[in-house]
């Protein structure tokens, strides 16, 4: 028996369902009574789901997994993982035994998009050219950790005086706070881009200073 899985990682959004694909080629005359199927976490070897004695033995993992029972006899040993969490990320091994046995590992990459950044300034009034200002770009509930980029109005990257912190909440999702300290010119636009490296999702925020008063562009 030869087990096949997708070589590319399965990317799943938090709180959605994911299918970890696994298949084998049954011999003629194959019956489910012969099948021993095990899904387990590759690293810890913790059991996730199993099928033996001709029947589905159920989920051993948070009661959030399921097989596709009607498709097993055709060689489809895929696993459905419901309501994906950050902690589900990792490698899963699909082990199939009939007479011979084989296994293969499939990677699950969990992702969550970042919110549109909110921009704040400190100080936020009585600003004059030459003042030092702190601009904070905040984006929430994303996964995995973000990449943060700052640019000025001409698109020139701003890399100095940038401090970025990322804190995971109780669900493992990250809140990003990036602080740019800059000396104001006569006017200017400062934009922050928060990128999710897995989803290739970019979330933009910007603030424009045009003399007095300061203006924030309307949200797109």
């Amino acid at each position: 028996v030869e087990v096949q899985v997708s070589e590319d990682p399965v990317v799943a959004l938090v709180d959605t369902d994911a299918t970890l694909r696994c298949s084998f080629s049954p011999e003629p005359g194959f019956s489910l009574a012969q099948l021993n199927l095990i899904w387990q976490l590759t690293d810890t070897k913790q059991l996730v789901h199993s099928f033996t004695e001709g029947r589905d033995q159920g989920s051993a993992y948070s009661n959030r997994t399921a097989l596709f029972p009607d498709l097993l006899v055709q060689g489809n040993a895929s696993l459905r993982l419901q309501r994906v969490r950050v902690t589900d990320e990792g490698s899963y091994t699909c082990f199939v035994s009939i007479q011979d046995f084989d296994s293969a590992a499939v990677s699950l990459q969990v992702a969550a998009p970042y919110s549109k950044p909110s921009m704040t300034l400190e100080p936020n009034k009585d600003l004059r050219p030459g003042n030092m200002v702190t601009i904070t770009c905040s984006s929430y509930q994303g996964y995995p950790e973000a990449e943060v980029f700052w640019k000025d109005g001409q698109g020139v990257p701003l890399t100095g005086n940038v401090t970025t912190s990322q804190m995971a909440n109780e669900r493992g999702l990250f809140d990003v706070h990036s602080v740019l300290r800059v000396v104001l010119g006569a006017n200017g636009t400062y934009s922050c881009l928060v990128r999710n490296p897995v989803l290739q999702q970019d979330a933009h925020g910007s603030v424009t200073i045009t003399g007095q008063p300061l203006t924030f562009p309307p949200e797109a």
Partner: antibody
Framework: EVKLVESGGGLVKPGGSLKLSCAAS????????MSWVRQTPEKRLEWVAT????????YYPDSVEGRFTISRDNAKNFLYLQMSSLRSEDTALYYC???????????WGQGTSVTVSS | DIQMTQSPASLSASVGETVTITCRTS??????LTWYQQKQGKSPQLLVY???TLADGVPSRFSGSGSGTQFSLKINSLQPEDFGSYYC?????????FGGGTKLEIK
């Protein structure tokens, strides 16, 4: 008649290496998973390594992972166990065994003795 | 990892007696349990697989039972050739684990 014959055992110093062989006959070798199991001087049986019929997947307990390598030559009907960084606790009688499905080993060889001592 | 405990470690019995050897696991292993017999100076031989299925050629006085975490091997009307060592073995998490063995001796 299913027949498994191990060879290659002997006396080796700690840190040394040894390669065991198992000649299989009487069945379609490539259709079966194979394992090495050892029996300690205290008569305990310990699983050492397993390989799938096609040779694509191998499995080891933590105690030998990274030190032992199981392999097979389906054209010649041979199973191998390359052992390195040997320790005194690896001293045992090493059996090769054929799998029936995944969980059961239905035929065993007569064993080959490995002694790790300075 | 699932732990396995085989008992007793040794047992004395007479020909014609009935004996029972047990194997307990720390977690549910369904029916993934095998029993082997090993006679002095010989290699292990398959006796029972899938907890209760007798291997080909094994006399009907042997029987396996149990599921989940508790398993037993029963030998009715012991014969002289039944004396030796018995091992249970489970398969779980793509690992194969043997019990400590039971040495069955003639009383």
């Amino acid at each position: 008649e299913v027949k498994l014959v191990e060879s290659g055992g002997g006396l080796v110093k700690p840190g040394g290496s040894l390669k065991l062989s198992c000649a299989a006959s009487g069945f379609t070798f490539s259709s079966y998973g194979m394992s090495w199991v050892r029996q300690t001087p205290e008569k305990r049986l310990e699983w050492v390594a397993t390989i799938s019929g096609g040779g694509t997947n191998t499995y080891y307990p933590d105690s030998v992972e990274g030190r032992f390598t199981i392999s097979r030559d389906n054209a010649k009907n041979f199973l191998y166990l390359q052992m390195s960084s040997l320790r005194s606790e690896d001293t045992a009688l090493y059996y090769c065994a054929r799998h029936y499905g995944s969980q059961t080993m239905d035929y065993w060889g007569q064993g080959t003795s490995v002694t790790v001592s300075s | 990892d699932i732990q396995m405990t085989q008992s007793p470690a040794s047992l004395s019995a007479s020909v014609g007696e009935t004996v029972t050897i047990t194997c307990r696991t720390s977690g549910n292993i369904h029916n993934y349990l095998t029993w082997y017999q090993q006679k002095q100076g010989k290699s292990p031989q398959l006796l029972v697989y899938n907890a209760k299925t007798l291997a080909d050629g094994v006399p009907s006085r042997f029987s396996g039972s149990g599921s989940g975490t508790q398993f037993s091997l029963k030998i009715n009307s012991l014969q002289p050739e039944d004396f030796g060592s018995y091992y249970c073995q489970h398969f779980w998490s793509i690992m194969w684990t043997f019990g400590g063995g039971t040495k069955l001796e003639i009383k």
